[in-house]
Amino acid sequence: EVEKTACPSGKKAREIDESLIFYKKWELEACVDAALLATQMDRVNAIPFTYEQLDVLKHKLDELYPQGYPESVIQHLGYLFLKMSPEDIRKWNVTSLETLKALLEVNKGHEMSPQVATLIDRFVKGRGQLDKDTLDTLTAFYPGYLCSLSPEELSSVPPSSIWAVRPQDLDTCDPRQLDVLYPKARLAFQNMNGSEYFVKIQSFLGGAPTEDLKALSQQNVSMDLATFMKLRTDAVLPLTVAEVQKLLGPHVEGLKAEERHRPVRDWILRQRQDDLDTLGLGLQG
């Protein structure tokens, strides 16, 4: 912490401007009024204060707002956000998506920090659900965001928000998460025609039950092997050889390369050899 020293003559800050970057830490502490700082926060991010100087500015804001910063200050934190701890952020009430975007921008290009995770958590809880605009914003900054949520948290995602989800946003989701997201996606895309529906639902199919896979097999969807390998084993096992052949279309030949891997391995073991032989791939049940 910076020790209290008197401000040198003529150095008292009248406004937040570039001249302050030449102030040492103790001079900032002594010469910048916290109330002035709070009212001119929009200027702070336009001035290239160093990390050490930001320590002092944060200290001033903490003294002024011990119960947590108002949103008018939060939205202009800029690089000062990097100085905030999760404990600081838990005191905030962030309601504006623009504020959220401004703070995520500061952390852009970096992995999700505990500070960002806390900020998002506060924001989403404040909204009550993960609406489409919020999800759009979060997945734009953090493609893996959706898969970082628990199944319980995912249950608050309304089906309408699923339109914002891109295939890469689901890359790290596990089956439990896809179990929650798939029914929402099915509902969201229900009015689309066959081929368009399959394009949209494809990345969610890791949560699909057997009956839906059977239905898809009747629609000439030509599912690729990568998607097939992500299906739930318990959903694949009841499928007949004919249904898998229809589901995969020309990609059925790829089963041979995957015969030792789940779910293909387990599915093969459930089939009659006569049925497997109809594929002409040399699969051994």
């Epitope: 970057i21 030449f22 040492k24 336009a46 290239p48 990390y51 990097l82």
Partner: antibody
Framework: QVQLVQSGAEVKKPGASVKVSCKAS????????MHWVRQAPGQGLEWMGM????????IYYEKFQGRVTMTVDKSISTAYMELSRLRSDDTAVYYC?????????????WGQGTLVTVSS | DIVMTQSPDSLAVSLGERATINCKAS??????VAWYQQKPGQSPKLLIY???TRHTGVPDRFTGSGSGTDFTLTISSLQAEDVAVYFC?????????FGAGTKLEIK
């Protein structure tokens, strides 16, 4: 990859001005402050100031205030540093450099340097 | 302004031996210190920042340490390509200031 390519060596007389250019490529020119640092022969490095290409906002080190002018031409991603009323002790290699994270002002990328010789 | 005093001015070390360069700040700068390497006829290259974090691609024989006012750059096993001038820089506050440099040669 990030590249900062500077103009060639200059020889100037005392009292004259010199204008050094720095052409940037490999990154979004308007995203980062452009800094200027000089190095007198056999000496250490001396920071002169910076300019933000997006806002034209300049911050000069007090020592050079009134003699230095930093400008940019966004259309050709080029920064300029003009030093006026040259003295013999301004003889130095002048570098442009960028800092990726403003709050951590370490110099991430440097130009190759421009030697300015001030001699009568 | 914060003055960075580097020592020694020059240093001769045998190949494979340890080289140590010191830098003292006139005020407490926390860990806001960077180290640069400058080979003859070249511009400086960033080696270390935050006093001890190696920049991308910098060999692990280069180590930085220190905080407050005293900082050290150590090259654990000198290689021929390490012959250069080394500078420290503080970025605690502006103006950004550098040490005068330490010339490292092979003994």
């Amino acid at each position: 990859q990030v590249q900062l390519v500077q103009s060639g060596a200059e020889v100037k007389k005392p009292g004259a001005s010199v204008k050094v250019s720095c052409k940037a490529s490999g990154y979004t020119f308007t995203s980062y402050y452009m800094h200027w640092v000089r190095q007198a022969p056999g000496q250490g490095l001396e920071w002169m100031g910076m300019i933000h290409p997006n806002s034209d906002n300049t911050i000069y080190y007090e020592k050079f205030q009134g003699r230095v002018t930093m400008t940019v031409d966004k259309s050709i991603s080029t920064a300029y540093m003009e030093l006026s009323r040259l003295r013999s002790d301004d003889t130095a290699v002048y570098y442009c450099a960028i800092i990726i994270t403003p709050v951590v002002p370490k110099f991430d990328y440097w130009g190759q340097g421009t030697l300015v010789t001030v001699s009568s | 302004d914060i003055v960075m005093t580097q020592s020694p001015d020059s240093l001769a070390v045998s190949l494979g031996e340890r080289a140590t360069i010191n830098c003292k700040a006139s005020h407490d700068v926390g860990t806001s210190v960077a180290w640069y390497q400058q080979k003859p006829g070249q511009s400086p290259k960033l080696l270390i920042y935050w006093a001890s974090t190696r920049h991308t691609g910098v060999p692990d024989r280069f180590t930085g340490s220190g905080s407050g006012t005293d900082f050290t750059l150590t090259i654990s096993s000198l290689q021929a390509e390490d012959v250069a001038v080394y500078f420290c820089q503080q970025y605690s506050s502006y103006p950004l200031t550098f040490g005068a440099g330490t010339k490292l040669e092979i003994k």
